[in-house]
């Protein structure tokens, strides 16, 4: 049976995708065929076949970026070391080990789901401006994060969530494969408005919050909340 695993990695970091037999295993590299492939995009990540040192079948996206350790393979550790993780690496990776001496039966089959994350920049909230006499507009911008963020606006007077119908979010996939988000909030003009913009990265369980107040161009101190207990508490903790 295929084992299933999940692992997380930050964009730009290195990650190990585990595929290993129990400790104490010994393998002859002239006996095993090892293939690492992606399940969705159907690409060859790396492989080992007996008496063959060239890797001409490896996809260009993974050449020189994905390695198995020969010393590890002798011990039954066929784990993949993936360098400089990119958002495009967020896939299922399949490790398959076949033994020639066992009639090419599967020795090991592991599917590893790689989740990729990147921190969003601290949001920047523009000073409010008035497109009309009875309306105020705020803009919140945050860039270079992954995966796609959630954006919330808060009434900081009572820490309540503003109606999402008041905001218009535009999310861009930038040249690096990361997300940039711009959220525009339109609210009715009141004498004093104290609002905050929160960018939530669900995978990292991280919120970035910045505030803006009418009559004050300087946003409140930036705040980062990590590992909140639940969605409700997460928001409350961030907006205090």
């Amino acid at each position: 049976d295929t084992q299933e695993k999940e692992v997380r990695a930050m964009v730009g970091s290195d990650v190990e995708l585990s595929c290993a037999c129990p400790e104490g295993s010994r393998f002859d590299l002239n006996d095993v065929y090892v293939y690492w492939q992606t399940s969705e995009s159907k690409t060859v990540v790396t492989y080992h076949i007996p008496q063959n040192s060239s890797l001409e079948n490896v996809d260009s996206r993974y050449r020189n970026r994905a390695l198995m350790s020969p010393a590890g393979m002798l011990r039954g550790d066929f784990s993949l070391r993936l360098f400089n993780v990119t958002p495009q690496d967020e896939q299922k990776f399949h490790c398959l080990v076949l033994s020639q001496s066992l009639g090419f039966q599967e020795v090991l089959s592991v599917e590893v789901t790689l989740h990729v994350a990147a921190n969003f920049s601290v949001p920047v909230v523009s000073a409010p401006h008035s497109p009309s006499q009875d309306e105020l507009t705020f803009t919140c911008t945050s860039i270079n994060g992954y995966p796609r963020p959630n954006v919330y606006w808060i009434n900081k007077t009572d820490n309540s969530l503003l109606d999402q119908a008041l905001q218009n979010d535009t999310v861009f996939l930038n040249m690096r494969g990361l997300y940039d988000v711009v959220s525009v909030l339109r609210i009715a003009r009141t004498p004093s408005v104290n609002i905050g913009c929160c960018i939530e990265n669900v995978l990292l369980q991280q919120n970035l919050t910045v505030g803006s107040q009418t009559g004050n161009d300087i946003g409140e101190r930036d705040k980062i909340t990590e590992n909140p207990v639940s969605t409700g508490e997460k928001n409350a903790a961030t907006w205090s």
Epitope: D1, T2, Y35, Q37, S39, K42, T43, V44, Y47, N57, D59, K92, H94, L96, F104, Q105, E106, S109, E111
Partner: nanobody, 116 residues
Framework: EVQLVESGGGLVQPGGSLRLSCAAS????????LGWYRQAPGKQRELVAH???????VYPDSVKGRFTVSRDNTKNTVYLQMNSLKPEDTAVYYC??????????WGQGTQVTVSS
């Protein structure tokens, strides 16, 4: 379990050609590895060709340049084109398909005999 049925084997003279087919009972596009293997009497099973999910191929030196593996996803069939056959290619040829969710499936084999 996926059913695999090989066909196309037979008796051929040295230097001749044969084309083996392996028909699968389900879509072959979901398989990460499609393989052809052979086993001669008294010998262990050996690799003939691996067809990886993206279309890359792997051949042992013994058949490289003579054998070609291919697939037709619309027919759910894998092929092995064998040219310049030699007496030492005589064996039962097996088809194999592997997918993470389905495991490994084997066909029943087809006999290839190269003899004058």
């Amino acid at each position: 379990e996926v059913q695999l049925v090989e066909s196309g084997g037979g008796l051929v003279q040295p230097g001749g050609s044969l084309r083996l087919s392996c028909a699968a009972s389900r879509s072959i596009s979901s398989f990460n590895l499609l393989g052809w293997y052979r086993q001669a009497p008294g010998k262990q099973r050996e690799l003939v060709a691996h067809l990886l999910s993206g279309g890359s191929t792997v051949y042992p030196d013994s058949v490289k340049g003579r054998f070609t593996v291919s697939r037709d996803n619309t027919k759910n069939t894998v092929y092995l084109q064998m040219n310049s056959l030699k007496p030492e290619d005589t064996a039962v040829y097996y088809c194999n398909a592997i997918a993470p969710a389905l495991g490994s499936s084997w066909g029943q084999g087809t006999q290839v005999t190269v003899s004058s």
